[in-house]
Amino acid sequence: QNCSGPCRCPDEPAPRCPAGVSLVLDGCGCCRVCAKQLGELCTERDPCDPHKGLFCDFGSPANRKIGVCTAKDGAPCIFGGTVYRSGESFQSSCKYQCTCLDGAVGCMPLCSMDVRLPSPDCPFPRRVKLPGKCCEEWVCDEPKDQTVVGPALAAYRLEDTFGPDPTMIRANCLVQTTEWSACSKTCGMGISTRVTNDNASCRLEKQSRLCMVRPCEADLEENIKKGKKCIRTPKISKPIKFELSGCTSMKTYRAKFCGVCTDGRCCTPHRTTTLPVEFKCPDGEVMKKNMMFIKTCACHYNCPGDNDIFESLYYRKMYGDMA
């Protein structure tokens, strides 16, 4: 969007912004908009919150179309009510080792965070907090009703989880990469971020990728088969093109998405990979963005809860990126 044309704003009055979000002029100095926050997608017309020291990081100069709101170098982090300096590592609880980098916090789990799917010897796995122990452990609940019959067990399988190896050492560098954060949107296009020092200079850097856990328009519950409670990875009938702020992916993708459950469980990406996607914009500009592609999803009771900041922080993460 170039700023050379006359300013004209939407017909409705200036928006009401949520608490803590600044009402600012767009990047052209034309219209009042709610500032984008840390980790959100931004454009020239949708600027980041300047009062929080954020700027729109477009990545390479060739991609000056859509960026991610990023804190200026050295910006501190506020986490759990405590301020941490950029570069500072801290143990947020007995379960997580975290690092602050330019306003973003990346955390590594100190406990095993595998997703355990039902299996013949443990058809109803559940994580429980044991007295005197920090990390939760898996226990096997007895089934509430004995309706599980032999052939049905074929549907159960254990899934591998692939995570970064936190003890990888390379040329005097202890390579550490946090898990990808949860997608910022439960449906539609969002952003997922992580912190890593897996680079030539062993410097901590933030990485971001686009993500789509499921399309917003899909009514997935309709596809749940009779007698079932979940649809873990619904089949997408036709290849789709991704849309990003008016730009469209140049290729079509037969992407996998995560489904839904009707029994209180949530379905989240289990194994993912990161691939570049090229988007073509109406003005002909082409930009390349990294995007999460789902390999498998898992449906589980470890849904994000507001009662525990760390639980919700981690369980909304993407498991096992393979790229």
Epitope: P6, R8, L25, C28
Partner: antibody, heavy 119, light 111 residues
């Protein structure tokens, strides 16, 4: 009542300067763009300049950019047009207008102030 | 963008319909896909007043005998039943591209 009142016009010699003022009342001034439109004697309307809510963006007729400046003071509910190096062809009635910045442009106009550039 | 109005003057009997045409030298669709074509009336000795915005939307307090239509480069203002208070000069205006420009004006007289 919504009102715009211009002042500062008058007779000035070629090469001289004038500063026009427009005092606004009856509405939340900082919620609107403001503009200046002029009308030479016996001629049609000509857009001169407009300014955004807080004065951080101004747009002017290209041929006037080097000589004219639009500014505003939200604390005083006023918009200004600084005119330098005036020429005979700048002789006109200068209207201050409210610009909604949304659906329509000039929904409220002042009565105008006359600027005459002559030796 | 040059805005060309026709006719330049118009003499109409009270109660008759009046029609004024405005042609732009290029499409006046703004980059946000709206068309900012407006009509203003300047009554004798007065400041201009807004009649129509975005091609066909009537401004607050404007009687429904005024209507606007058109698209692309061709636009029309119609006054269905001319009244004595309608006399004056009518200007079309485009706000989609810089410089913002007015037509040269159409003078409406009462027969």
């Amino acid at each position: 009542e919504v009102q715009l009142v211009e002042s500062g016009g008058g007779l000035v010699q070629p090469g001289g300067s004038l500063r026009l003022s427009c005092a606004a009342s009856g509405f939340t001034f900082s919620d609107y763009y403001m503009a200046w439109v002029r009308q030479a004697p016996g001629k049609g309307l000509e857009w001169v300049a407009n300014i955004n809510y807080e004065g951080s963006r101004t747009d002017l007729l290209a041929s006037l950019k080097s000589r004219f400046t639009i500014s505003r003071d939200n604390a005083k509910n006023s918009v200004y047009l600084q005119m330098n190096s005036l020429r005979a062809e700048d002789t006109a009635v200068y209207y201050c207008a409210r610009d909604t910045s949304r659906g329509s442009y000039f929904d409220v106009w002042g009565a105008g102030t006359t600027v005459t550039v002559s030796s | 963008v040059v805005m060309t109005q026709t006719p330049l003057s118009l003499s109409v009997s009270l109660g008759d319909q009046a029609s004024i045409s405005c042609k732009s030298s290029q499409s006046i669709v703004h980059y946000n896909e709206n068309t900012y074509l407006e009509w203003y009336l300047q009554k004798p000795g007065q400041s201009p007043q807004l009649l129509i915005y975005k091609v066909s939307s009537r401004a607050s307090g404007v009687p429904d005998r005024f209507s606007g239509s058109g698209s692309g480069t061709d636009f029309t203002l119609k006054i269905s039943r001319v009244e004595a208070e309608d006399l004056g000069v009518y200007y079309c205006f485009q706000g989609s591209h810089f410089p913002l420009t007015f037509g040269q004006g159409t003078k409406l007289e009462i027969k």
